[in-house]
Interface confidence: medium
């Protein structure tokens, strides 16, 4: 089951899965110039049994010629607004979720990709959040969004993460950036777009993690 | 089940000081910011103060700033509000929040009433 | 410090009634907004957050839309459990700011 939002927004933070469960969708985008090859996938699938997990199809994308009307896959400005891309500074791995039996892991890149990975999650995805540079968090532990199905319909679970200036002490963000539409009340139709911006996993972990800038919920 | 109740609440006269309490419990409060809102009677709500988990990052309305406090103490699930130099327009009604989220969870409310 | 302007300030409406309350931030907030009802005595419960998100557990007949300095809270079909007052809260900057607040009353 697709979740049918995306996960919610924090003022100066970013998320980061760790991991994909199986069923998870990331759309084959092609940087401007580039299109997707005309017998390409639209899309690779996380896929898999109870011991093995991959990546099913393949991204290819080839030169656009100059007289290409063919719209950019790359998002153009106007479209961007719509999406949310997170950009991580150096993200932390709580858990190696990537061996966990039903997840995969980060996909490699392929040639000419776009810098925007557009990624549709299903219900049980986790993501992690944590401050960009120059931000700290006023909670502690690991601030993090489940996808959960509550009476047939999605909703993400709200990290509780505060991320505040360091320098800027008169400046005090807030919580969650708007989704596009109410947890279960669509107001309009709102597709399932997830991007991150060249998030290529990092695997080892945070030599910060005892001062993890992660929040966690309430236990 | 989470669970604020603020103390210390009265009457006070101008210039003088009260400190108010806000006994938390029902999640892990050595891991939450957490704020003062105040509301004085018959009227709207304002933030006073907020503070980080570890009490390293404090933020003050202008309205309080150099007169009142915020602080914590993580071991015994308290958070303070110490106020000092008291004047009229600080009566009010104030509440102790969890400032994850902007005010998800609130206490009932404690009113200090400035007097002479 | 942004300003928060709710209008109107106090509404009578009745049981079924569609009631629209509306909130002018004094500068852009990005939708970094919260609002909130309030019941004599009692502490504010917040309904909805980030301009539109419904807080878990608030009736679906609430509903938030808006952007940029305007927001607007809808209750699509007033229930009697719904009269009290209202306040808009803009998060994007330090110190968060309320609006003075819409007392909706039964008409």
């Known amino acids: 089951e697709l979740c049918d939002d995306d996960p919610p927004e924090i003022p100066h933070a970013t998320f980061k899965a760790m991991a994909y469960k199986e069923g998870t969708m990331l759309n084959c985008e092609c940087k401007r110039g580039f299109r997707r090859i005309k017998s390409g996938s639209l899309y690779m699938l996380c896929t898999g049994n109870s011991s093995h997990s991959s990546w099913d199809n393949q991204c290819q994308c080839t030169s656009s010629a100059t007289r290409n009307t063919t719209k950019q896959v790359t998002p153009q400005p106007e479209e961007q607004k719509e999406r949310k891309t997170t950009e991580m500074q150096s993200p932390m791995q709580p858990v190696d979720q990537a061996s966990l039996p039903g997840h995969c892991r980060e996909p490699p890149p392929w040639e000419n990709e776009a810098t925007e990975r557009i990624y549709h999650f299903v219900v049980g995805q986790m993501v992690y959040y944590q401050c960009v540079q120059g931000y700290r968090a006023l909670h502690r532990g690991p601030a993090e969004s489940v996808c959960k199905m509550t009476h047939g319909k999605t909703r993400w679970t709200q990290p509780q993460l505060i991320c505040t200036g360091e320098m800027e002490t008169s400046q005090f963000p807030g919580e969650e950036k708007p989704q596009a539409s109410p947890e279960g009340r669509p107001e309009s139709e709102t597709s399932c777009l997830v991007t991150t911006t060249d998030f290529q996993i990092q695997t080892e972990m945070a030599a910060t993690m005892e001062t993890s800038i992660f929040t966690t919920e309430y236990q | 089940q989470v669970q604020l109740v603020e103390s210390g609440g009265g009457v006070v006269q101008p210039g003088r000081s009260l400190r108010l309490s806000c006994a938390a419990s029902g999640f892990t409060f050595s891991n939450h910011a957490m704020a003062w809102v105040r509301q004085a009677p018959g009227k709207g709500l304002e933030w006073v103060a907020v503070?980080?988990?570890?009490?390293?990052?404090?933020y003050y309305a202008d309205s309080v700033k150099g007169r009142f406090t915020i602080s914590r103490d993580n071991a015994k699930n308290t958070l303070y509000l110490q106020m000092n130099s008291l004047r009229a327009e600080d009566t009010a009604v104030y509440y102790c929040?969890?400032?994850?989220?902007?005010?998800?969870?609130w206490g009932q409310g404690t009113l200090v009433t400035v007097s002479s | 410090d942004i300003q928060m302007t709710q209008s109107p300030s106090s509404l009578s409406a009745s049981v079924g009634d569609r009631v629209t309350i509306t909130c002018r931030a004094s500068q852009s907030i990005s939708s970094y907004l919260n609002w909130y009802q309030q019941k004599p005595g009692k502490a504010p419960r917040r309904l909805i957050y980030g301009t539109n998100s419904l807080q878990s557990g608030v009736p679906s007949r609430f509903s938030g839309s808006g952007s940029g300095t305007d927001y607007t809270l809808t209750i699509s079909s007033l229930q009697p459990e719904d009269f009290a007052t209202y306040y808009c809260?803009?998060?994007?900057?330090?110190?968060?700011?309320f609006g003075q607040g819409t007392k909706l009353e039964i008409k």
């Open positions: 929040t969890t400032g994850w989220n902007s005010g998800y969870d």
């Open positions: 503070i980080s988990y570890d009490g390293s990052n404090k």
């Open positions: 809260q803009q998060y994007n900057s330090w110190p968060w700011t």
